[in-house]
Every structure is written in C-alpha cells, then in structure tokens.
Amino acid sequence: KFSKQSWGLENEALIVRCPRQGKPSYTVDWYYSQTNKSIPTQERNRVFASGQLLKFLPAAVADSGIYTCIVRSPTFNRTGYANVTIYKKQSDCNVPDYLMYSTVSGSEKNSKIYCPTIDLYNWTAPLEWFKNCQALQGSRYRAHKSFLVIDNVMTEDAGDYTCKFIHNENGANYSVTATRSFTVKDEQGFSLFPVIGAPAQNEIKEVEIGKNANLTCSACFGKGTQFLAAVLWQLNGTKITDFGEPRIQQEEGQNQSFSNGLACLDMVLRIADVKEEDLLLQYDCLALNLHGLRRHTVRLSRKNPIDHHSIYC
C-alpha cells in the first residue's frame, strides 16, 4: 500500500526515501523485504541506511528488489516499501522510457528544466546538462542551482535532457544522471481569467469505498503558450504535498490545445483505496494564472456498489 517505485543505473549513486511517514518519526530501520535482513547503517557498506534514506553507493543491478522501511516512534511503528530497479547502462544514446522522469514544458518566458531527484543528494554546482546525449554549449544554456535555463526557447529545443551531477559521501564521489523530456509551447496567443471545465462547481462525485477513484481538474487559460498557468488540487485548503496522505496523489494530465486554440491543463487526483474519511474532505480544483484564481469544490459521496457506471481505475 505504501510503496514507491525508484530506479537508477548501475555504477551510479541512487538514494531512495522511505515512502512511509511516521507521525512523528524518531528512527527509520531498513530491511531487505525478501530476507528480512537488516540493512546496515555503517557508511562503509556499499548499500546502507541513513534515517529516511536508503543509499546505494554505487548501485548494482543485483540491488533490484523491494526494500522495507519501518518508521519507529515511542508509540507506534509504520511500514513502507521501496521498489528499486537498477538498470544496466545503455551503450547507445537512447534513453528508454522506463528511465525517464516526468515531462516538463517550457516557453520563451519560462524555460526551467529541473533535475529530477537531486534534492536527495549531496551535490555541488554546477550541474552538467546534455540534450539527446550532447553536452550543452553556448550562452543560451545556463545551469542554475538545480535547474537548467534556456534563453530564447525555440521549438527545436524540445527533446530529452539529462542532468549529470556528483554525489559526495564522506569524501567519495559518485556520478548520478537523470533524464526527462522537455516540450516547447507556442508563444502566440493571449490569456484569460481561468475557466474550469471540470469539475462543475459544488459537484458531488460518487465513489465506492475500497476502490480507486480519479478526479480531474481541467481548466483553460487562453490561447497559445501561457506564461503562468496552473491547475492543482487542494484538500481542506491544503496542498496535496503538504497534506501527507500517500493514498491521495495528484498527477499532471496532458497539456491540451484544442482546435479552437485554447490552452488547457489537466490535473488528475488519484485516490487509492477510497476510505470513509475521504468522504469528509473538501476537494478543491484550483486554476490560476496572472489574471487570478478560480476554485471549484467537489465532495465525495458513497456510491451504491450495484451501479456499475464508474470512474474507477
């Protein structure tokens, strides 16, 4: 239930965070799930635990598997699972889909590409950036902190961008690479006050206890590339990331551009294993841009299990 997928390349550093949060958390113990053998905390080991983090320095293909973390406190212990896959390095330039992090979009005014997972590592600037395996050179490219800025973005800048950095652990250096796709949005157009297409205001969404449910927040912001436009979900007025419920996650849907030229965004709220208490929460679909913010509120109600017209995964 509290499981997270992580991946890396052999001979590179990989650091994984325990997907379970104790409230509160005093110590975290890590185990090999298959053998129940404790993972050492001594840093001289190639694979070792360091609080909420599990470190592979460096990773090997044989490290692939499921790891158990137990968050301990004086009162109760909570368990999570990290599903780790370590892949062999590709001989060619092609980065397979299973090694790709989420796609990001940019425009002439906003062209930041963040280096995925870098916050878990002890790294020092500058990052090295590559596009389709070629080192980026020229004044248009600026590596700034944990992201790449591209000046005067053009359609040709779309592609796969790899960040490469060095993780330092007790004086030893380990290489890390991470790749994500970058797409370029057309700059022509205008922006409007956000229009939320879904959900309807004060919509009641029927869900079935124990099943999965998806809520889609969809809004349009104008025509062409939008300088600042976002859709997001809030629970009881709190950001999903701050809410701290691993069962409830939001995922960016497809950036849409309809035939009428409207620029729209989707954000899908995924609720795994719907619980009774989820019915008590207020779900707010927020759409915001430079013109302002629009909010549509949704509440969940229990669905009659006999009714098979459903939105479940």
Partner: antibody, heavy 118, light 112 residues
C-alpha cells in the same frame, strides 16, 4: 485548518463509566496518532494513552491501564476515550491531542470536564 | 518513568522582564538519533495547552522569537527575553523520549 472538537461536560457517579469523543477535521485522520491527556483541577498534565487510528493499535499509561479504552472511528474521523470505575480523583479536564511528523501534542481539543460526584 | 521537575513553581514578573524557567529530567532526553525530546507548553486558564517549543530549541509555528529554550541531556531552560502581557500563563516542560510521556508540574508566571 486543523480542529479537534470534543464532546461536552459530563457529571458521573463513582463507579460509572464516561465516554468522551474527539472529532478531527482539517487533516487525514488516519495519518496522525491521537493521544489523551488528563488535567485534574489546579494540577498538571498527565498522559493517559494513544491510538493509531489507521490500525487501531493502542498504548496506555500504567496508571490508567485496565480502566481506560481508546478507540477510533475512521468513517467519522472521531476518537473516543472511555474511562471506567470512576472515582472522585478522576474529576478532571480531559484533552485529546494530535501529532504531526515532527512532534506529539501538536493540536489540542478544547477539553472536556468530567465531574465525579455522589 | 522519567520524572520532570520544574522550578520555580511560580514567579512574579513585570512586562519587559527577562524570565527564566528551569526543568530537569531524571534521565537524559537525548535520543540515539541526536535529537533531544524536550518540549515546552504554555497554558492559560480555561484553555488547552499550546505547544511553544519542540525538540529542545525549535519554535513552534507562530510562536514569537522572544521565547527560547536551551539545555543539555537533563537540564533545560525556557527563557522569555522580554515578558509581554499575553505571556502571563502556566508553562510546562515535557518529555517525549519514551513512554509514558511525562510533564513537569508547571510554572505559573504571574504579574508582579
């Protein structure tokens, strides 16, 4: 905004049982432990016990063991504290208090006064 | 059980005064993770306690910077650098190192 709302004051006779409720809102109920703390009139704070609403696991202070039962109803995001075999020294304000990632006793209910009198 | 002993049990002070409350635990509150699990709470008459400081020296959200806490494994101090009218209350130290969680008996800060 996190809120813990407790049930109203109670007057009980010695030997009776009291059950206090604590309704949580503004956060995921099952994600945070719920603790109960006693405060006798003019006295200090005393930890009674706690529940993990997700699993129903409980832990109690030795002083209250056998007389206190803490439960949680996930469907209504409500925790309960039941104290049996009441005696006059159980006259106190009882608080429910929730935890966060960093610390216990982060959020508090308004308190419920229980008076035990014959 | 870990005993928490506060002193003084009460004190009188004026607005603007620097106030110090001490707390001693019968056992070190230093966990193997390096954190000292000492907490301070403020309680006003008829109200629930309010968290002031967690893990020895961290100010809880919304707590003014005039409150500070320091100490070692067993001896701790809560300091109010310049007492304000709203600070007149009872202060409790507490330990969350191990069960049962225990509180000090409280220090009442009164207007002189």
């Amino acid at each position: 905004e996190v809120q813990l709302v407790q049930s109203g004051a109670e007057v009980k006779k010695p030997g009776a049982t009291v059950k206090i409720s604590c309704k949580a809102s503004g956060y995921i109920f099952i994600d945070s432990e719920m603790h109960w703390v006693q405060q006798a009139p003019g006295k200090g704070l005393e930890w009674m016990g706690a529940i993990d609403p997700e699993t129903g696991d409980t832990v109690y202070a030795e002083k209250f063991q056998g007389r206190v039962t803490i439960t949680a109803d996930k469907s209504s995001s409500t925790a309960y504290m039941e104290l049996s075999s009441l005696r006059s020294e159980d006259t106190a304000v009882y608080y429910c208090t929730g935890s966060t990632t960093d610390y216990y006793f982060a959020y508090w209910g308004q308190g419920t006064l229980v008076t035990v009198s014959s | 059980d870990i005993q928490m002993t506060q002193s003084p049990s009460s004190l009188s002070a004026s607005v603007g005064d620097r106030v110090t409350i001490t707390c001693r635990s019968s056992k070190s509150l230093l966990h193997s993770n390096g954190i000292i699990y000492l907490y301070w709470y403020q309680q006003k008459p008829g109200k629930a306690p309010k968290l002031l400081i967690y893990q020895l020296s961290n100010l809880a959200s919304g707590v003014p910077s005039r409150f500070s806490s320091s100490g070692s494994g067993t001896d701790f101090t809560l300091t109010i650098s310049s007492l304000q009218p709203e600070d007149f209350a009872t202060y409790y130290c507490a330990q969350n190192l191990e069960l049962p969680f225990t509180f000090g008996q409280g220090t009442k800060v009164e207007i002189k």
